[in-house]
């Protein structure tokens, strides 16, 4: 003969206001013959939640038909949950007795608590862009969850980050809680296409965490590299000079040519291309009129990127046909 066990599998049951809660209870034996009742709390002040035989329990229904002879499932559903329903619920086996039935064995209890899902995490990056090799901070916030226990993780391109600080408020008892986390991320030159992800796991989410994302493209500035070159072939009395602006982000860029210190308005042609890593290249061509009488022509390609200080690259033009050497230098 198997000894009667009262099985209440959930230690904690999180429910939402207005929803229906299912409290599970099964028994391993039908003996001794007698009813199973549900109570909230323990001791003399416990509250009767359900008694199959008598009483009116309009919000309670049974999962199984308790009148069936071999029923071993005494689970109940409580509808329209309110904050007043929180507490620990016990299914209790009674054996038949006289003048009253006698309590025989109690289940371990299921604590019913109000659960609230966290809001979708919102990730905010820095107000201003920063160049690679520097550290930027991202914040992640989620609100309105209960109970207080929550797990937050940070990822960069799928790799978990470890440099972050998290706070859950308030520290004491509350109906709902908020979480705020700040992660420090070192920027890499290829981070234009990178993402940071804030992942929040909570018991109310049933193993399906919420995620908030931010694109590092909003936080990074990759400064350009400049190169000015003279094309070896000359067309009549014109020389083609190229200014190559490489690997910059964002796209915002102003390029000006100057000839011996005088800004020129003309620009023959230019092309913008996007690299695989999300940075851009800009190529500008400049045609210079030369004559044999002109000894020195210094061309300057000046680039102003994303509102930063201008950078420039100079090229001393070689006008002698047989001279192939080209000298250049850069000035900030």
């Amino acid at each position: 003969e198997e000894e009667l066990q009262m099985i209440q599998p959930e230690k904690l049951l999180l429910v939402t206001v207005g929803k229906t809660a299912t409290l599970h209870c099964t028994v391993t034996s039908l003996l001794p013959v007698g009813p199973v009742l549900w109570f909230r709390g323990v001791g003399p002040g416990r509250e009767l939640i359900y008694n199959q035989k008598e009483g009116h329990f309009p919000r309670v229904t049974t999962v199984s038909d308790l009148t069936k002879r071999n029923n071993m499932d005494f689970s109940i559903r409580i509808s329209s949950i309110t904050p007043a329903d929180v507490g620990t619920y016990y299914c209790v086996k009674f054996r038949k007795g006289s003048p009253e039935n006698v309590e025989f064995k109690s289940g371990p209890g299921t604590e019913m608590a109000l659960g609230a899902k966290p809001s979708a995490p919102v990730v905010l990056g820095p107000a201003a862009r920063t160049t690679p090799e520097h550290t930027v901070s991202f914040t992640c916030e989620s609100h309105g969850f209960s109970p207080r226990d929550i797990t937050l993780k940070w990822f960069k391109n799928g790799n978990e980050l470890s440099d972050f600080q998290t706070n859950v408020d308030p520290t004491g008892q509350s109906v709902a809680y908020s979480i705020r986390s700040t992660a420090r991320v070192v920027l890499d030159p290829w981070d234009v296409r990178s993402q940071v992800i804030c992942e929040v796991a909570h018991v109310t989410l049933q193993g399906d965490p919420l995620r908030g994302t931010a694109n590092l493209s909003e936080a990074i500035r990759v400064p350009p590299t400049l190169e000015v070159t003279q094309q070896p072939m000359r067309v009549g009395n014109q020389v083609n000079v190229t200014c190559q602006v490489r690997k910059f982000y964002p796209q915002s860029l102003q390029l000006t040519w100057s000839e011996n210190g005088n800004v020129c308005q003309r620009e023959t042609a230019s092309t913008l291309t996007e690299n695989k890593d999300g940075t851009y290249n800009w190529t500008s061509w400049f045609l210079v009129n030369i004559s044999d009488q002109r000894d020195d022509v210094v061309l300057t390609c000046q680039v102003k990127h994303d509102g930063q200080l201008a950078v420039s690259k100079r090229l001393a033009l070689e006008v002698t046909v047989h001279q192939k050497d080209q000298s250049s230098d850069a000035t900030p």
């Epitope: 003969e1 039908l30 003996l31 199973v36 199959q52 308790l66 054996r95 038949k96 006289s98």
Partner: antibody, heavy 120, light 107 residues
Framework: QVQLVQSGAEVKKPGASVKVSCKAS????????ISWVRQAPGQGLEWMGW????????NYAQKLQGRVTMTTDTSTSTAYMELRSLRSDDTAVYYC?????????????WGRGTLVTVSS | DIQMTQSPSSVSASVGDRVTITCRAS??????LAWYQQKPGKAPKLLIY???NLQSGVPSRFSGSGSGTDFTLTISSLQPEDFATYYC?????????FGGGTKVEIK
Amino acid sequence: QVQLVQSGAEVKKPGASVKVSCKASGYTFHGYGISWVRQAPGQGLEWMGWISAYSGETNYAQKLQGRVTMTTDTSTSTAYMELRSLRSDDTAVYYCAREAGSSWYDFDLWGRGTLVTVSS
Amino acid sequence: DIQMTQSPSSVSASVGDRVTITCRASQGISSWLAWYQQKPGKAPKLLIYAASNLQSGVPSRFSGSGSGTDFTLTISSLQPEDFATYYCQQGASFPITFGGGTKVEIK
């Protein structure tokens, strides 16, 4: 096999006592209650009382209070019903029945009955 | 005590007939009512428990319904072996009480 086997018929004189036995087999005796029900010749069923085989607690019909005693012996899985100060209107077939309801009382297993005749 | 009143006290019917027996409790007993069949010289046999649950091994032509104070036992198609006396019994509280019985006889 699940059954209740009752002792044999008895003939008693008025004022005497009778003790009827009911031996259970094929199930866990102390997990259930036993009720005793009697039926006078040509009459309906009358509940006499109930005993918990687990605890020995009893509940008797008011009209028999003081004359009836129900007991159990869990070592032999046997229930007993003793009726004292017998009268002629106690002549009846006495049944023991296993009480099987969880929140209620009903009888899913019956003995074959013991005829008790009270006659001078 | 809860009084159980059965009607009719007897009914004559033929094989194949639909037979209905009613039982009324003097006060509400929820669904805690059982029905028994008894043949002469035999112990009662449980047919229906908790008003509408068919006891294991009982043919499905027997059915029970009702709750509160009014209950019904129905035999959908009377068979030769169904001629017997039928009793209702309330199991809501002590003292347990039986109805007076309904004898189903061959017409």
